[in-house]
């Protein structure tokens, strides 16, 4: 039986140019983690495994750092990159856990409209 | 001034499909997420799912996986959301809402479907 | 999903009073950066939802200062200073924080 959660950042907002992290937490399981891969629809951006540790899909290399820990940093970010991300889990015995974060980034102008919040 | 006009009431028979589209003005259609809210028995708001217009990145809450499909013309400023394998359950009253920093901002004024044999 | 849970249900009032509604979330609605998602909306019958307070705290642009939004973490209030006929209606509170977002069950305010 499953009996992990997962916690994330929670969806972040951003402006153009600025970075992020992206970071998940599994808990509640004994589960063995053995690798962790970051999706973006349905490219792959970055796979960490426990044994051979990280692998940044070339097409990410310019602007995706592995961590801090499990997580994932981008930088440079342009309003392409607004989307959901996941990070999936592969566990051993419990299986596959996946946690989602949507990640909105703003040009400027718009970021500025309304004053609305103060972006990290 | 920021305007989502969706079309109008539709009246359909279980098991088929149809689409409601909402048409933005008054802004930048590609800037913002465009959300998809439904509202059962004049009460409970449930998020269908969401689409960036910039690149065609969706969203999509899991209870809706398989029975909403998100879609946009970035030409016409115009946001379509298709219903599949309509059921008496799906009848309800549907919202697109742009959404800035995670909040829904402007709404359009909603599409009464009507699921009946 | 975060559950996101409202209090009362129905709130029957008279114009002039000061309301309070509360908003329970079952997980911290405050994003890594110390940001948190939480707006509440007025659902008017046979009008759209509209925005009132974003960011916990802050109006969005034509709405009175009568309502005033507040809270952290879990735990969210919405207050309305002086009644008016134009607030009644349905008031949800959204938690934007967490995918999916998800709404309060809503709260009734209704003339008593």
């Known amino acids: 039986m499953m009996t992990g959660t997962i916690e994330t950042t929670g969806n972040i907002s951003a402006e153009k140019g600025g970075s992020i992290i992206l970071q998940c937490h599994l808990s509640s399981t004994t589960a063995q983690v053995t690798q962790v891969n970051w999706e973006q629809q349905d490219q792959l951006l970055a796979i960490c495994n426990a044994d051979l540790g990280w692998h940044i899909s070339p097409s990410f290399k310019d602007r995706v750092a592995p961590g801090p820990g499990l997580g994932l940093t981008l930088q440079s970010l342009t309003v392409n990159d607004t989307g959901e991300y996941f990070c999936i889990y592969h566990t051993y015995p419990d299986g596959t856990y996946t946690g989602r974060i949507f990640l909105e980034v703003l040009e400027s102008s718009v970021a500025e409209h309304g004053a609305r919040f103060q972006i990290p | 001034e920021v305007q989502l006009q969706q079309s109008g009431p539709e009246l359909v028979k279980p098991g088929a499909s149809m689409k409601i589209s909402c048409k933005a003005s008054g802004y930048s259609f590609t800037g913002y997420t465009m959300n998809w809210v439904k509202q059962s028995h004049g009460k409970n708001l449930e998020w269908i799912g969401l689409?960036?217009?910039?690149?065609?990145?969706?969203s999509y809450n899991q209870k809706f996986k398989g029975k909403a499909t998100l879609t946009v013309d970035k030409s016409s400023s115009t946001a379509y959301m298709e219903l599949l394998s309509l059921t008496s359950e799906d009848s309800a009253v549907y919202y697109c809402a742009r959404s800035l920093r995670f909040s829904f901002d402007y709404w359009g004024q909603g599409t009464t479907l009507t699921v009946s044999s | 999903d975060v559950v996101v849970t409202q209090t009362p249900l129905s709130l029957p009032v008279s114009f002039g009073d000061q309301v309070s509604i509360s908003c329970r979330s079952s997980?911290?609605?405050?994003?890594?950066?110390?940001?948190?998602?939480l707006s509440w909306y007025l659902h008017k019958p046979g009008q759209s939802p509209q925005l009132l307070i974003y960011g916990i705290s802050n109006r969005f642009s034509g709405v009175p200062d009568r309502f005033s939004g507040s809270g952290s973490g879990t735990d969210f209030t919405l207050k309305i200073s002086t009644i008016k006929p134009e607030d009644l209606g349905m008031y949800y509170c959204l938690q934007g924080t967490h995918q999916p977002p998800t709404f309060g069950g809503g709260t009734k305010l209704e003339i008593k």
């Open positions: 689409i960036f217009p910039y690149n065609g990145g969706t």
């Open positions: 997980q911290s609605l405050a994003n890594s950066y110390g940001t948190t998602y």
